[in-house]
């Protein structure tokens, strides 16, 4: 015959543990039910009554099966340099990540404690290492035969066009200018971008018309949507 299924609360067999989604209550010395995510233990179990669970209040949560007396408080509202990527619900904490053009300079267990604006590379310099969610942009000087004419956190150095006859030679911050109407070989028009990480934005496209107010997720300084060291003395 199959073993009889015990209903909580029940005394466990010596040496055995409580089942999944149950916990051992030291006071009652019984296996008792845990509360589901989004709930907490309002009344702990006794030898004759199981745990009484209640829903988490607003702005509090429990993410796991638990027997905590109070739900955890959700984190504070996301700061102006961040975007709320996960809302506070009864079952999950709020998660804030850096908005486009920023990276996480100081992480916390989930999300980001402090964002900083991505540096940009000035003309004559291209992106050697793009910004990521947790690291700043690294720039490098454009090598001979390449150029960048933008101030950008995404553009790399790209080759000068090759002319039949050069009118103006290219340099690190300017493409070559050809005398003939068409060069023998040229790059496709437009800036070359590195793959754009979640935390960067294009520095070139101008919306038309320009909006006069920022969306609620946008910041400054840097103040931002933009923002947050330097060659030899960088941070």
């Amino acid at each position: 015959l199959p073993a009889q299924v015990a209903f909580t609360p029940y005394a466990p067999e010596p040496g055995s543990t409580c089942r999944l989604r149950e916990y051992y209550d030291q006071t009652a010395q019984m296996c008792c039910s845990k509360c589901s995510p989004g709930q907490h233990a309002k009344v702990f179990c006794t030898k004759t009554s199981d745990t009484v669970c209640d829903s988490c209040e607003d702005s509090t949560y429990t993410q796991l099966w638990n027997w905590v007396p109070e739900c955890l408080s959700c984190g504070s509202r996301c700061s102006s340099d961040q975007v709320e990527t996960q809302a506070c619900t009864r079952e999950q904490n709020r998660i804030c990540t850096c908005r486009p053009g920023w990276y996480c300079a100081l992480s916390k267990q989930e999300g980001c404690r402090l964002c900083a604006p991505l540096r940009k590379c000035r003309p004559g310099f291209g992106v050697a290492r793009p910004g990521t969610e947790t690291s700043d942009v690294v720039c490098k000087p454009c090598a001979p035969g390449t150029f960048s004419n933008t101030t950008s956190s995404t553009d790399i150095c790209r080759p000068h066009q090759i002319c039949n006859v050069v009118a103006i030679p290219g340099n690190a911050s300017m493409d070559a200018v050809c005398t003939s109407t068409s060069p023998t070989r040229s790059m496709a028009p437009g800036a070359v971008h590195l793959p754009q990480p979640v935390s960067t934005r294009s520095q070139h496209t101008q919306p038309t018309p320009e909006p006069s107010t920022a969306p609620s997720t946008s910041f400054l300084l840097p103040m931002g949507p933009s923002p947050p060291a330097e060659g030899s003395t960088g941070d």
């Epitope: 700061s79 102006s80 340099d81 053009g101 300079a105 100081l106 404690r113 402090l114 900083a116 604006p117 540096r119 940009k120 590379c121 000035r122 004559g124 310099f125 720039c139 490098k140 000087p141 933008t150 101030t151 950008s152 934005r201 294009s202 520095q203 070139h204 496209t205 101008q206 919306p207 320009e210 909006p211 006069s212 107010t213 920022a214 969306p215 609620s216 997720t217 946008s218 910041f219 400054l220 300084l221 840097p222 103040m223 931002g224 949507p225 933009s226 923002p227 947050p228 060291a229 330097e230 060659g231 030899s232 960088g234 941070d235």
Partner: antibody, heavy 124, light 110 residues
């Protein structure tokens, strides 16, 4: 030489409007975040607002709804439109580039250069 | 909204003195802090960015330190041309900003 020059200041009556200009030379306005900062006579610096490279704008809480920032890329000029002016808006208004250049990097969180400023007086 | 509290609001010092100005942020701003010098009738001039990096052309007697919420501007040996007002500025110009500047510190001749 990288330079910003403000213009358009003057005397205006309370409730009136004024549009300030900030002309850039030596760099393209559209590739930098540009800020407006003001300074009332004998007082400290007060941030007014910013226009980011993408054209989005942000303002100090006290300036929202009354001030707007726009940009004319063809003229390489920035504008600050101020409406419903009050006596407490009397100040020198500066434009400042968000982006200090160093070692190939641009730091958008530092303001450099600044214009020379233009005085706005709101009085009846 | 990050608030910057600068102290002292004014100080008197003599040429050659070591001068220290502090700036406290109401919440952590990492190293996103700049210092400016302003002389009467002139626009502010950037001295230090990212808390401790000196801008080109600024004398080495100026130095910046700090991270998080507490920052310091130090002038190791005050010179006659250093008498001015100094401002700190945090690097966040977001959606809930009242001001990004501290209240200023006026350095006067004793």
């Amino acid at each position: 030489e990288v330079q910003l020059v403000e213009s358009g200041g003057g005397l205006v009556q309370p409730g009136g409007s004024l549009r300030l200009s900030c002309a850039a030379s030596g760099f393209s306005l559209s590739t930098y975040d540009i800020n407006w900062v003001r300074q009332a006579p004998g007082k400290g610096l007060e941030w007014v607002g910013i226009i980011y490279t993408g054209g989005i704008t942000n303002f100090a809480n006290w300036a929202k709804g009354r001030f707007t920032i726009s940009r004319d890329n063809s003229k390489n000029t920035l504008y600050l439109q101020m409406n419903s002016l009050r006596a407490e808006d009397t100040a020198v208004y500066y434009c400042a580039r968000g982006g200090y250049d160093s070692e190939g990097y641009v730091y958008p969180d530092a303001f450099d250069p600044w214009g020379q400023g233009t005085l706005v007086t709101v009085s009846s | 909204d990050i608030q910057m509290t600068q102290s002292p609001s004014s100080l008197s010092a003599s040429v050659g003195d070591r001068v220290t100005i502090t700036c406290q942020a109401s919440e952590s701003i990492s190293n996103l802090l700049a210092w400016y010098q302003q002389k009467p009738g002139k626009a502010p001039k950037l001295l230090i960015y990212r808390a401790s990096i000196l801008t080109s052309g600024v004398p080495s007697r100026f130095s910046g330190s700090g991270s998080g919420t507490d920052f310091t501007l130090t002038i190791s040996s005050l010179q006659p041309e250093d008498f001015a007002t100094y401002y700190c500025q945090h690097g966040y110009t977001g959606t809930n900003v009242q001001n990004v500047f501290g209240g200023g510190t006026k350095v006067e001749i004793k």
